[in-house]
Interface confidence: low
């Protein structure tokens, strides 16, 4: 397993609709044709997998099983969007990139993007 540098923004604020987007960029040492991207969430020293996608270079990412993530790729950049976030989902979201094919296998893990989610204030009931 060879190491690879992965860059991602330090902080992102989710929208009022609970959507957060950020770019995950990796320094590809070779000509990878198959890439796997995994988003991990670290909170309270616990790491959980949020979503994962495998894609062919130049093609779109396919997230599986009702994923809360969507994404597009462009060269060595992956544009990730995480939906349905609530205040309790605030945490450090780490981008992990694996160059699956062809060999050799490379692995890169970013420093993480701190995503802040603020639940919108509920609208007061209207009297008609």
């Amino acid at each position: 397993c060879k190491a690879m540098h992965v860059a991602q923004p330090a902080v992102v604020l989710a929208s009022s609709r609970g959507i957060a987007s950020f770019v995950c960029e990796y320094a590809s040492p070779g000509k990878a044709t198959e890439v796997r991207v995994t988003v991990l969430r670290q909170a309270d020293s616990q790491v959980t997998e949020v979503c994962a996608a495998t894609y062919m270079m130049g093609n779109e990412l396919t997230f599986l099983d009702d994923s809360i993530c969507t994404g597009t790729s462009s060269g060595n950049q992956v544009n990730l969007t995480i939906q349905g976030l609530r205040a309790m989902d605030t945490g450090l979201y780490i981008c992990k990139v694996e160059l699956m094919y062809p060999p050799p296998y490379y692995l890169g893990i970013g420093n993480g993007t701190q995503i802040y989610v603020i639940d919108p204030e509920p609208c007061p009931d209207s009297d008609f």
Partner: antibody, heavy 120, light 106 residues
Framework: EVQLQQFGAELVKPGASVKMSCKAS????????MDWVRQSHGKSLEWIGN????????SYNQKFKGKATLTVDKSSSTAYMELRSLTSDDTAVYYC?????????????WGQGTLVTVSS | QIVLTQSPAIMSASPGEKVTMTCSAS?????MHWFQQKPGTSPKLWIY???ILASGVPARFSGSGSGTSYSLTISRMEAEDAATYYC?????????FGTGTKLELK
């Protein structure tokens, strides 16, 4: 009504290639990926790969890279799979099946399968 | 790749009997999905996202589980339930199917 139409059977010689089709109807062809699954006689199911008819991007099971090529013809709402360098191990029923999305279950629709027999 | 092992490989049950079959994954998966297949026919989606019954599936079927251990249960076996059942994961590529459990009528 969603339908995936596959055609019967193919008898091919070892080393040859075969191209099978899967004609979709009853939905917008470009809205859903199409997957292909293999089932050897009396065995389990193996996922070969899938294709996005809109972008024509593909994902393959590593096992079938170099063996299978997935393509589509959007004008006729038809997905194709070509298998090359066939051996007796490739004798199987090949199914096309439709992906889902957040609202529709995956693999809810299947073709009736194409039986490929590799024999000299 | 994630390997799915189903047990038992073959089982038989009498009408009215409760049936449980299991699917064990080599690593954790988000959901498990189940397909029913009868000889000479295409597989049918039977249970998806672990516990949701596909359209037309009788309520005597149920699915449960999490992580690496999942199961399909029939509360009361009926003759039409005799078939082979396959589990499937879509958590990571390549998508994989289980080895299958053949359910026979006793």
């Amino acid at each position: 009504e969603v339908q995936l139409q596959q055609f019967g059977a193919e008898l091919v010689k070892p080393g040859a290639s075969v191209k099978m089709s899967c004609k979709a109807s009853g939905y917008t062809f470009t809205d859903y990926n199409m997957d292909w699954v293999r089932q050897s006689h009396g065995k389990s199911l193996e996922w070969i790969g899938n294709i996005n008819p809109n972008s024509e991007s593909t994902s393959y099971n590593q096992k079938f890279k170099g063996k299978a090529t997935l393509t589509v013809d959007k004008s006729s709402s038809t997905a194709y799979m070509e298998l090359r360098s066939l051996t007796s191990d490739d004798t199987a029923v090949y199914y096309c099946t439709r992906d889902g999305n957040r609202y529709d279950a995956w693999f809810a629709y299947w073709g009736q399968g194409t039986l490929v027999t590799v024999s000299s | 790749q994630i390997v799915l092992t189903q047990s038992p490989a073959i089982m038989s049950a009498s009408p009215g009997e409760k049936v449980t079959m299991t699917c064990s994954a080599s690593s954790s998966v988000t959901y498990m999905h189940w397909f029913q297949q009868k000889p000479g026919t295409s597989p049918k989606l039977w249970i998806y996202s672990t516990s949701i019954l596909a359209s037309g599936v009788p309520a005597r079927f149920s699915g449960s589980g999490s992580g690496t251990s999942y199961s399909l249960t029939i509360s009361r076996m009926e003759a039409e339930d005799a078939a082979t059942y396959y589990c499937q994961q879509r958590t990571s590529y390549p998508l994989t199917f289980g080895t299958g459990t053949k359910l026979e009528l006793k």
